[in-house]
Interface confidence: low
């Protein structure tokens, strides 16, 4: 029978999107077992090495060159088969990446997306790319794929993520490619980490020695929880930068982070956020907004939370 | 590519004011931070400051009542300023681009450095 | 702020030979920490970042590792451009560099 049932499953490890110059082993996966198969592939670009040949259990690719990518499938050996082998197995695009100069990926609104809601991960450059790839780490699914906009000499593509939720989070890279070439892909994005908040109870936000101060005055704020939370994140209304720190367990059974500001220079409306060591990109609600007015000087000592927003440095609008 | 090129007046004289410019090509000013960096001869390295891709500025602590940092985006030019000088203010002044490899708390390294302009204060 | 003692300040190695500095943060750092290799004349070089990871273009034989508030960095089979200065980074909280190890040959 040579049904959908019977079809070999073909896999590629540890990831289908791989570095030029990187790995990848191909398995053919038939009747329960990894069996010997042929390779086939849909552009027919000629790679010496497995024409016509037969493999057993897997086949290693390395180094990865641009001839590499491309569609392929399996068959795997079915002896009772008139030909000796089985159907076509699904088919696994690989995908070379570094041929082109990365491109850059931004969230908008921001990076921090509230449990439910949606996130905009935006992949632009000035190269026009036909598409562009939106890869999630971690994940072995093909990478998903939109056609690049242009407009203003930027080529762009708008990924929408959502309803949010921890499966969704993570870090994200996007790719470009050229129409000539659809397999071959640009160098990866800066990475970008997607936080969903709100699944755990807020902390609790407040300043010492109080939330108005003096310039020069040294203000520390301190973010506390009955919630055992591993860590702490500080930000700061209108920018991306956030602080973290350990959360230490207090005698009264709390646990907090003390941040020190260091003298007082720069005001704004803080948030806190807390997570656990295991769940990364989990983050609590944030705390209710503590506004920190100080009279003086406005340049600020500490990393100002209003730059930069993504990885790359890149200003969190959309262009 | 990315390239950083300081250019500043080589010798002031002590108590008087400093400004280097450092300009940048191979990328925007208005998607990176450019850093200053400073060498007192024999001495290591300091960092002085920061003016980020949307133009805040954050400074070294110990020079923040001396130091100013701008920019002009459309000509790809930053600028130190730098007032009161005094002969320990002789150093290689470097600037440099911003860049991370993480979102989580946004930490920042520079990857791309200016070769250097050299400063003297002395009368 | 944070301080970073970088040891030793002057190291006399062999070439083909392996050489190791390290930086001890006065704080935990969360690995993060960047190595460079600065020559006379021009700007520092990024050889690594976040602890261990290798820039583009940089030979694998430089290499860093650590945690917490100790970190090292090592060349091995070290080569004539290799002898220069080499500083760490701390980019945890602001920024501060340690002071430096002048790489000689013996």
């Known amino acids: 029978h040579m049904g959908g049932q019977d079809k070999p499953f073909l896999s590629a490890w540890p990831s289908a999107v791989v570095p030029r110059g990187g790995h990848v082993t191909l398995r053919c996966h038939y009747r329960h077992r990894f069996n010997n198969f042929m390779l086939y592939k849909e552009d027919r670009i000629h790679i010496p090495i497995f024409h016509g040949r037969i493999f057993q259990e897997s086949f290693n690719m390395s180094p990865v060159t641009t001839a590499h990518a491309g569609n392929y499938t399996c068959r795997g050996s079915h002896p009772h088969s008139p030909t000796g082998w089985s159907a076509p197995s699904n088919p696994v695009v690989i995908m070379v990446t570094g041929n082109h100069r990365k491109p850059s990926l931004l969230a908008h609104p921001g990076p921090l997306v509230k449990s439910g809601e949606r996130v905009i991960l935006q992949c632009w450059s000035d190269i026009m790319f036909e598409h562009f790839f939106l890869h999630k780490e971690g994940i072995s699914k093909d990478p998903s794929r939109l056609v690049g906009q242009i407009h203003d000499g930027v080529s762009k593509a708008n990924f929408s993520i959502g309803p949010m939720m921890l499966a969704l989070a993570g870090t994200y890279r996007c790719y470009g490619s050229v129409t000539h070439t659809p397999y071959q892909l640009s160098a990866p994005s800066d990475p970008l980490d997607i936080v969903v908040t709100g699944p755990y109870e807020k902390p609790s936000l407040s300043a010492q020695p109080g939330p108005k101060v003096q310039a020069g005055e040294s203000v520390t704020l301190s973010c506390s929880s009955r919630s055992s939370y591993d860590m702490y994140h500080l930000s700061r209304e209108g920018g991306a930068h956030e602080r973290r720190l350990p959360a230490v367990r207090k005698v009264n059974r709390t646990f907090q982070a003390d941040f020190p500001l260091g003298p007082a220079t720069h005001g704004g409306t803080y948030r806190c956020f807390g997570s656990f060591r295991h769940s990364p990109y989990e983050w609590s609600d944030p705390s209710d907004p503590l506004l920190v007015s100080v009279t003086g000087n406005p340049s600020s000592s500490w990393p100002s939370p209003t730059e930069p927003s993504s990885k790359s440095g890149n200003p969190r609008h959309l262009h | 590519q990315v390239q950083l090129k300081e250019s500043g007046p080589g010798l002031v004289a002590p108590s008087q004011s400093l400004s280097i410019t450092c300009t940048v090509s191979?990328?925007?000013?208005?998607?990176?931070?450019v850093h200053w960096v400073r060498q007192p001869p024999g001495k290591g390295l300091e960092w002085l400051g920061v003016?980020?891709?949307?133009?805040?500025?954050n400074y070294n602590s110990a020079l923040m009542s001396r130091l100013s940092i701008s920019k002009d985006n459309s000509k790809s030019q930053v600028f130190l300023k730098m007032n009161s000088l005094q002969n320990d203010d002789t150093a290689m002044y470097y600037c440099?681009?911003?860049?991370?490899?993480?979102?989580?708390?946004?930490?920042?390294?520079?990857?791309?450095w200016g070769q250097g302009t050299t400063l003297t204060v002395s009368s | 702020d944070i301080q970073m003692t970088q040891s030793p300040s002057s190291l006399s190695a062999s070439l083909g030979g392996k050489v190791t500095i390290t930086c001890k943060a006065s704080?935990?750092?969360?690995?993060?920490i960047a190595w460079y290799q600065h020559k006379p004349g021009k700007g520092p070089r990024l050889l690594i970042h976040?602890?261990?990871t290798l820039q583009p273009g940089i030979p694998s034989r430089f290499s860093g590792s650590g945690s917490g508030r100790d970190y090292s960095f090592s060349i091995s089979n070290l080569e004539p451009e290799d002898i220069t200065t080499y500083y760490c980074?701390?980019?945890?909280?602001?920024?501060?560099f340690g002071g430096g190890t002048k790489l000689e040959i013996k």
């Open positions: 440099a681009r911003g860049n991370s490899n993480h979102y989580v708390s946004s930490f920042y390294y520079f990857d791309y």
């Open positions: 191979g990328f925007s000013l208005t998607s990176f931070g």
């Open positions: 003016i980020w891709a949307g133009g805040s500025t």
């Open positions: 704080q935990d750092i969360n690995k993060y």
């Open positions: 976040y602890t261990s």
């Open positions: 980074l701390q980019y945890d909280n602001l920024w501060t």
